[in-house]
């Protein structure tokens, strides 16, 4: 079974410990990833002025980054646990290619970038165990991801900085929305 960051595998195996998918552990795990994103963003902001760019300017991009919408069933008003969980897992799977792109984008925070990527994989595994409707989860095509990765890496330096900033900000917002929804499950 996947082990959360900062957790001992023997704790996980203990007979009276909480199940791995308890909201407290998922909460802690998502916050661990959020902390990693913050560290990566500090490096990004220190080396470029992207963080000063207005949200509107950043919105003018052709990245198809996952986002929560009303129809996804993650807001309490139209809350649907199964639909929402599928959206969260699908979104995280879609972010994986972007997290792969980030791997060569950091110098001093290279390990942090890897930790964010690996922690996200572990989070996906946790949530897949929790999901009843695994058939509804669409995994991105490897060939599509490979061509997207090539395209992103071929951008000029300015666009790569912009892309890095956008991915980190969007991933943060997606994780925060996911955490709010998972708290209701």
């Amino acid at each position: 079974a996947p082990v959360l960051p900062g957790e001992d595998s023997k704790d996980v195996a203990a007979p009276h410990s909480q199940p791995l998918t308890s909201s407290e552990r998922i909460d802690k795990h998502i916050r661990y990833i959020l902390d990693g994103i913050s560290a990566l963003r500090k490096e990004t902001c220190n080396r470029s002025n992207m963080c000063e760019s207005s949200k509107e300017a950043l919105a003018e991009n052709n990245l198809n980054l996952p986002k929560m919408a009303e129809k996804d069933g993650c807001f309490q008003s139209g809350f649907n646990e199964d639909t929402c969980l599928v959206k969260i897992i699908t979104g995280l799977l879609e972010f994986e290619v972007y997290l792969e792109y980030l791997q060569n984008r950091f110098e001093s925070s290279e390990e942090q970038a890897r930790a964010v990527q690996m922690s996200t994989k572990v989070l996906i595994q946790f949530l897949q165990k929790k999901a009843k409707n695994l058939d509804a989860i669409t995994t991105p095509e490897p060939t599509t991801n490979a061509s997207l990765l090539t395209k992103l890496q071929a951008q000029n330096q300015w666009l790569q900085d912009m892309t890095t900033h956008l991915i980190l900000r969007s991933f943060k917002e997606f994780l925060q929305s996911s955490l709010r929804a998972l708290r209701q499950m």
């Epitope: 902001c45 900000r169 709010r180």
Partner: antibody
Framework: EVQLQESGPGLVKPSQTLSLTCTVS??????????WSWIRQPPGKGLEWMGV???????YYSPSLKSRTSISWDTSKNQFSLQLSSVTPEDTAVYYC??????????????WGQGTQVTVSS | NFMLTQPPSVSGTLGKTVTISCAGT?????????VSWYQQLPGTAPKLLIH???TRASGIPDRFSGSKSGNTASLTISGLRSEDEANYYC??????????FGGGTQLTVLG
């Protein structure tokens, strides 16, 4: 003990830009998962949320004020600021800065500044 | 300009119970469990009473309680005291990374 203190001009002319600063003591503005909001209260009226800057420096604004509002921070001084452009007399209010202790799953304000009165008049 | 709907004023008798309502939509109160309540005395900054619908802030007596049903939140004050006379505001998180306040309710405590 966290303390917030607003500062800025008490009188601003119509069409000008209102600039206010909130100085935070007793804790860093970059502490995860804190967020820092500006909230105003026109005379005799209710509270109006204007916008927020979170622990990463990300900003979000009230849809009704978005086009005129800008929030920024100076982490070296532990301050965050509000700029409201093209002001009119309707922007006359007491302006408060406030802290949200957990922007991920909190959304409440546990510490407030004492407020600063801003009047828009020629 | 979005605003949650509160009654402009309510009154209650010393020692009795009063409830203040706060009506919103599925995009704010109905959509999230992030409702908070504040007390504001004249000439002072608001003070946090309740957050996350029903959690009392540090140092707030259990005479103050919060609840929510659908798109409406409520603040209940029992054992009314004269010092409870103040303005009360509700607030809620709103899609997406926004917050919204109510118009405020003036509570009058009758002898």
């Amino acid at each position: 003990e966290v303390q917030l203190q607003e500062s800025g001009p008490g009188l601003v002319k119509p069409s000008q830009t209102l600039s206010l600063t909130c100085t935070v003591s007793g804790g860093s503005i970059t502490t995860r998962y804190y967020a820092w909001s500006w909230i105003r209260q026109p005379p005799g009226k209710g509270l109006e949320w204007m916008g927020v800057i979170d622990y990463d420096g990300d900003t979000y604004y009230s849809p009704s004020l978005k086009s005129r509002t800008s929030i920024s921070w100076d982490t070296s001084k532990n301050q965050f600021s509000l700029q409201l452009s093209s002001v009119t007399p309707e922007d006359t209010a007491v302006y408060y800065c406030a802290r949200d202790p957990d922007v991920v799953t909190g959304f409440h304000y546990d510490y407030w500044g004492q407020g600063t009165q801003v009047t828009v008049s020629s | 300009n979005f605003m949650l709907t509160q009654p402009p004023s309510v009154s209650g008798t010393l020692g009795k119970t009063v409830t203040i309502s706060c009506a919103g939509t599925s995009s704010d109160i109905g959509g999230y469990n992030y409702v908070s309540w504040y007390q504001q005395l004249p000439g002072t900054a608001p003070k946090l009473l309740i957050h996350r619908v029903s959690t009392r802030a540090s140092g707030i007596p259990d005479r103050f309680s919060g609840s929510k049903s659908g798109n409406t939140a409520s603040l209940t004050i029992s054992g009314l005291r004269s010092e409870d006379e103040a303005n009360y505001y509700c607030a809620s998180y709103r899609n997406f990374n926004n917050a919204v306040f109510g118009g405020g309710t003036q509570l009058t405590v009758l002898g």
